[in-house]
């Protein structure tokens, strides 16, 4: 059994058929000696009296809120939680694996930038009773400063007979510099709390292998005389690191055509401009990569031909 | 501490084409190491990240860019100091800071250079002749290293009296090539930011 | 008062299904967990197993498991225990029971309901 | 599983006088055992828990003590109501198994 925050704990459970339960000794924080009793949840039964009242957990309805009073008076509370271990593996049902890149992925981290802020997000289909908290650090045997604000709810997505929730967090190194080489990686913990189920999810990822740019801004086309062909011009995202000449992006145009069927024209780039043909009710997209350190690619950013 | 925007004349920075030709080269030999070694931990997550020129070169220190001197957490207390004499410089106009850097970078490649061909000779001597280093690789550090011309003591290539541990030289070189690659970023970085100042 | 109502005896024929169960008052059902115990004519107890009435989490003795069906309806605070198909071997005395949380013994006892199966 | 065995299987004895059970398990199951009674055409009712722990309404001539695979109830000096079946119970380990009886019967 180890302490969440005040008052509220975990208990880890092998949870197999034949596993005996934890034994627990839950002691009231006061002065008194005598005439304590201790109640769970709403019920107003004593389920013991004394300073500790030792239980057994093995279920979920061992969890709990367990209050110690005297005469009528609340003295303090122990929330009980259980982190289940099934086969010697910490239970994963809170968080839906999101499979990408690659199975047993829970959270998902990106970064626009090399200034050390990155957002994380993972999915549920649990609504309600569903609480999160998230801590971070650079390196974990001595943890440098990470901040994360409070996990909240992004998004809402039907997929099929179930809601999906999405939940996100955005955390910022509290002194990293941009042109920094990483040789610790930054390490996220979210700890989940379904009613009286507590799980945690952790990830281990270097800021520059989360890059993903913003799309490219401004997106222009200007009609060359006498051609087919025009010019794309387009911008650094505002959210990209400066200066450009040393966080320099390079860039894919894609002119594609209505259908999807179409052959799409493929362009590569360090400029911010090309030169293409541009086809009717086709459009012109282009994404941006760090040119130097192949992350991934931003979203693209469009203009249609007409 | 960092760069000044100086501007070098037109095509008197040959240093850029070599660098962008060592990060393709030390790109191309990490994939194949990753791919010739995959039952070895050889990915970026199951390695440990060191850096062979940690206290002995400032490189990206030396090489800041003037824009980021304003960060505080980029100001490292971190202080080489390199002999200035290099070929990618704009001759007069160059600061000592801009030699600096670049004599940084010609010190972190003489290391990589000297770890490399080390490594290199363990390995022809293994009997399974699974992996060896990239002959253009060690081709590319050598050109970018001509190119930024600095005088330097040579330092000689560490000969190993016992039999070598061919699983740990292998488990060494996926370190190695993970570590230059990220400094061949930050020169190429560099590179990319001389030139357009 | 904690109070399990069961519900009255039975006479079935064997291959016919039946639906017992057990109705708590007295105190918040959701808290406590239920459970079932069989006592044949003239033998001892046994434990079939328990339900957690917040989110029916089951855990079945093996013994019984694919022989009865444990239920519960948490807006009635009634617990069920069900057959599919009954056995002559199915006759026995049931009692629904309370499980003391914290512990796991059964601290409350519905009065039980008679089963028999008999052609 | 574990087997729940008591002794003695029947035990006569008169009102006034100090009743001992026994009650041994086959494996450890700490201090996780519960004793019932049972009185004929009437469902069990709870006594002791956690070896050793009154039942709330449970007169205090009822004790129990053990812990491990050895355990024993008490009754410290007989009353007529006393007579009945006497079971005990560990919730250690599932699936929860319950000793096989014994019959306390006035001699």
């Known amino acids: 059994i180890w302490e969440l925050k005040k008052d509220v704990y975990v208990v880890e459970l092998d949870w197999y058929p034949d596993a005996p339960g934890e034994m627990v000794v839950l002691t009231c924080d006061t002065p008194e000696e005598d005439g304590i009793t201790w109640t769970l949840d709403q019920s107003s039964e004593v389920l013991g009296s004394g300073k500790t009242l030792t239980i057994q957990v093995k279920e979920f309805g061992d969890a709990g809120q367990y209050t110690c009073h005297k005469g009528g008076e609340v003295l303090s509370h122990s929330l009980l939680l259980l982190h289940k271990k099934e086969d010697g593996i910490w239970s994963t049902d809170i968080l839906k694996d999101q499979k990408e890149p690659k199975n047993k992925t829970f959270l998902r981290c990106e970064a626009k930038n090399y200034s050390g802020r990155f957002t994380c997000w993972w999915l549920t289909t649990i609504s309600t009773d569903l609480t999160f908290s998230v801590k971070s650090s650079r390196g974990s045997s001595d943890p440098q400063g990470v901040t994360c604000g409070a996990a909240t709810l992004s998004a809402e997505r039907v997929r099929g007979d179930n809601k999906e929730y999405e939940y996100s967090v955005e955390c910022q190194e509290d002194s990293a510099c941009p042109a920094a080489e990483e040789s610790l990686p930054i390490e996220v913990m979210v700890d989940a709390v379904h009613k009286l189920k507590y799980e945690n999810y952790t990830s281990s990822f270097f800021i520059r292998d989360i890059i993903k740019p913003d799309p490219p801004k401004n997106l222009q086309l200007k009609p060359l005389k006498n051609s087919r062909q025009v010019e794309v011009s387009w911008e650094y995202p505002d959210t990209w690191s400066t200066p450009h000449s040393y966080f320099s992006l390079t860039f894919c145009v894609q002119v594609q055509g209505k259908s999807k069927r179409e052959k799409k024209d493929r362009v590569f780039t360090d400029k911010t401009s090309a030169t293409v043909i541009c086809r009717k009710n086709a459009s012109i997209s282009v994404r941006a990569q760090d040119r130097y350190y192949s992350s991934s690619w931003s979203e693209w950013a469009s203009v249609p031909c007409s | 501490r960092n760069l000044p925007v100086a501007t070098p004349d037109p095509g008197m920075f040959p240093c850029l084409h070599h660098s962008q030709n060592l990060l393709r080269a030390v790109s191309n030999m990490l994939q194949k190491a990753r791919q010739t070694l995959e039952f070895y931990p050889c990915t970026s997550e199951e390695i440990d990240h060191e850096d062979i020129t940690k206290d002995k070169t400032s490189t990206v220190e030396a090489c800041l860019p003037l824009e980021l001197t304003k960060n505080e957490s980029c100001l490292n207390s971190r202080e080489t100091s390199f002999i200035t004499n290099g070929s990618c410089l704009a001759s007069r106009k160059t600061s000592f800071m801009m030699a600096l850097c670049l004599s940084s970078i010609y010190e972190d490649l003489k290391m990589y250079q000297v770890e490399f061909k080390t490594m290199n000779a363990k390995l022809l001597m293994d009997p399974k002749r699974q992996i060896f280093l990239d002959q253009n690789m060690l081709a590319v550090i050598d050109e970018l290293m001509q190119a930024l011309n600095f005088n330097s003591e040579t330092v000689p290539q560490k000969s190993s009296l016992e039999e070598p541990d061919f699983y740990k030289t292998k488990i060494k070189l996926c370190i190695l090539l993970h570590a230059f690659r990220i400094r061949a970023v930050t020169i190429d970085r560099v590179m990319s930011y001389l030139n357009a100042s | 008062e904690v109070q399990l109502v069961q519900s009255g005896a039975e006479v079935k024929k064997p291959g016919e299904s039946l639906k017992i169960s057990c109705q708590s008052s007295?105190?918040?059902?959701?808290?406590?967990?239920i459970g079932w115990v069989r006592q044949m004519p003239g033998q001892g107890l046994e434990w079939i197993g328990i339900?957690?009435?917040?989110?029916?989490?089951?855990r079945y003795n093996p013994m019984f498991r694919g022989q009865v069906t444990m239920s519960v309806d948490k807006s009635s605070s009634t617990a069920y225990l069900q057959w599919s198909s009954l056995k002559a071997s199915d006759t026995a005395m049931y009692y629904c029971?309370?499980?003391?949380?914290?512990?796991?013994?059964?601290?409350?006892w519905g009065q039980g309901t008679m089963v028999t199966v008999s052609s | 599983e574990i087997v729940l065995t008591q002794s003695p299987a029947t035990l006569s004895a008169s009102p006034g006088e100090r009743a001992t059970i026994s009650c041994r398990a086959s494996q450890s199951v700490s201090s996780w055992l519960a004793w019932y009674q049972q009185k004929p055409g009437q469902a069990p009712r709870s006594l002791i828990y956690a070896a050793s722990n009154r039942q709330s309404g449970i007169p205090a001539r009822f004790s129990g003590s053990g812990s491990g695979t050895d355990f024993t109830l008490t009754i410290s000096s007989l009353e007529p109501e006393d007579f009945a079946v006497y079971y005990c119970?560990?919730?250690?380990?599932?699936?929860?198994?319950f000793g096989q009886g014994t019959r306390l019967e006035i001699k």
């Open positions: 007295g105190y918040s059902f959701t808290t406590y967990w």
């Open positions: 029971a309370r499980r003391r949380p914290g512990q796991g013994y059964f601290d409350f």
């Open positions: 119970q560990q919730y250690n380990i599932y699936p929860y198994t």
């Open positions: 339900m957690s009435p917040v989110d029916s989490d089951i």
